[in-house]
């Protein structure tokens, strides 16, 4: 997977008036890395590993960048003409990537009230607009505003692409991201399935990076793909990931089965525990965490794109 840096900024308006402040999160390699603390008006690292990336350096540069981006986005929202009564949001997601072959990608996406209306490839400067008439109107509105000073805009996009990659390279240089490995915690449970059968579920949690093999083995050999059910590998909100695999087996045959886990060049095997079978089967909920963003998002049901 490529290394990536992802900026996620949102500004709000109420009854046509753009609100002060903004919400911002930065993801590094898909993990929550920074967020903008509106109380302290500063960029704050998300967890110890994020702190380790910059070591003893300050987060002034990040604070300055996020503040500037937030200001720009508020100005953009102010130029959107069709703002009606009530709460509205403008969200900008900017991503840059460095691939294994050292090639790069950068893009920028705008959402209004949770709906994508404008995308741009920051390398080719090519714009993409969804087909809907609302998106077309919004896109024209925003593009016109952004193009008011054509030369400034051209410089602006090249700079955004270059700055994002420069920051990403700076973070990668610390080696923390590249070296970081958190082995999974693995837990096996059993639950009632149907007459004579039980479902055994193997959960792996709190691991990084996200690449993992989790599979059931019978008498030492991996079960075929179609006899197992896998959950998605999802962020768990702590800068790590979680996933699960389940299979249905005959009651009394539990000891023939082992959950096999492989992560970052290491593996482990996890047998099915003996004891009472759980009657209630509780698979993990497949919801995306909002990583502690402002409650207004939850309260106003504003869609958050990840």
């Amino acid at each position: 997977e490529p290394h990536s840096l992802r900026y996620n900024l949102t500004v709000l308006s109420w009854d046509g008036s753009v609100q002060s402040g903004f919400l911002a999160e930065v993801h590094l390699d898909g993990q929550p890395f920074l967020r903008y603390d509106r109380q302290k008006c500063r960029a704050k690292p998300q967890g110890q590993w994020a702190e380790d990336v910059l070591g003893n350096k300050t987060w002034d540069r990040e604070t300055r960048d996020l503040t500037g981006n937030g200001k720009d986005l508020r100005m953009t929202l102010a130029h959107i003409k069709d703002q009606k009564e009530g709460l509205h949001s403008l969200q900008e997601i900017r991503v840059c990537e460095i691939h294994e072959d050292n090639s790069t990608r950068s893009s920028q996406h705008f959402y209004y009230d949770g709906e994508l209306f404008l995308s741009q490839n920051l390398e080719t400067e090519e714009w993409t607009v969804p087909q809907s008439s609302r998106a077309q109107t919004l896109a024209m509105n925003v593009r016109n505003f952004l193009k008011e000073d054509a030369m400034k805009t051209k410089t602006h996009y090249h700079a955004m692409h270059a700055d994002c990659l420069q920051e990403l390279r700076r973070y990668l240089e610390s080696g923390v991201v590249l070296r970081r490995t958190v082995p999974p915690m693995v837990n096996v449970t059993r639950s009632e399935a149907s007459e004579g059968n039980i479902t055994v579920t193997c959960r792996a949690s709190s691991f990084y990076p996200r690449n993992i093999i989790l599979t059931w083995r019978q008498d030492g050999v991996s079960l075929s793909h179609d006899t197992q059910q896998w959950g998605d590998v999802l962020p768990d909100g702590n800068g790590t990931y979680q996933t699960w695999v389940a299979t249905r087996i005959c009651r009394g045959e539990e000891q023939r089965f082992t959950c096999y886990m492989e992560h970052s060049g290491n593996h482990s095997t996890h047998p099915v525990p003996s004891g009472k079978v759980l009657v209630l089967q509780s698979h993990w909920q497949h919801h995306h965490h909002h990583h502690g963003l402002n409650d207004i998002f939850e309260a106003q049901k504003i869609e958050w794109h990840e």
């Epitope: 050999v221 000891q255 095997t269």
Partner: antibody, heavy 117, light 107 residues
Amino acid sequence: QVQLQQSGAELVRPGTSVKVSCKASGYAFTDYLIEWVKQRPGQGLEWIGGINPGSGSTNYNEKFKGKAILTADKSSSTAYMQLSSLTSDDSAVYFCARLDGNYVGYWGQGTTLTVSS
Amino acid sequence: DILLTQSPASLSASVGETVTITCRASGNIHNYLAWYQQKQGKSPQLLVYHAKTLADGVPSRFSGSGSGTQYSLKINSLQPEDFGSYYCQHFWSTPWTFGGGTKLEIK
């Protein structure tokens, strides 16, 4: 039939390294995990670690991390264990074995390692 | 790490006798216990796995039992070929440890 054929006895100097091999036959080599076990003269058995020959992933007993390195060659259906910085404490018989789920079903015949100056 | 305590460490018995070897785990190993027999200069041979399942080709005079933390291997009507060392091993969580062994000798 399943067979695990280990390399012959080794007499080596302290401080050097040695690589013990374990050639599997009679089954699909990449389907099963291979484990390694140490037995000092007149002593009990100690699990060193295991390898998945298909992927090369390993699982070590903490005690043997830095001492043993497990590898496997799919093309020759052979698992290897390299032991480094040898001392007299490493003098032992080393067994490879096939993990048949939640037990070891098949064992190699053992390789005797003697570390002596 | 789970510690397996095997007893007795050595045992003298006559052909035809019945003997029992026990293996106590320091934690619940959920029946993931195997028993092996080892003759001098040879590799261990699987006798019993999953605490009570007899491996292929193992005579029925051998039997395994137990659960939780307490397990035992029973040999009925000892035969001359049964003499040697016996080890238990758990497979609940790594490191997979062995018991200290029981040396069964002819009286």
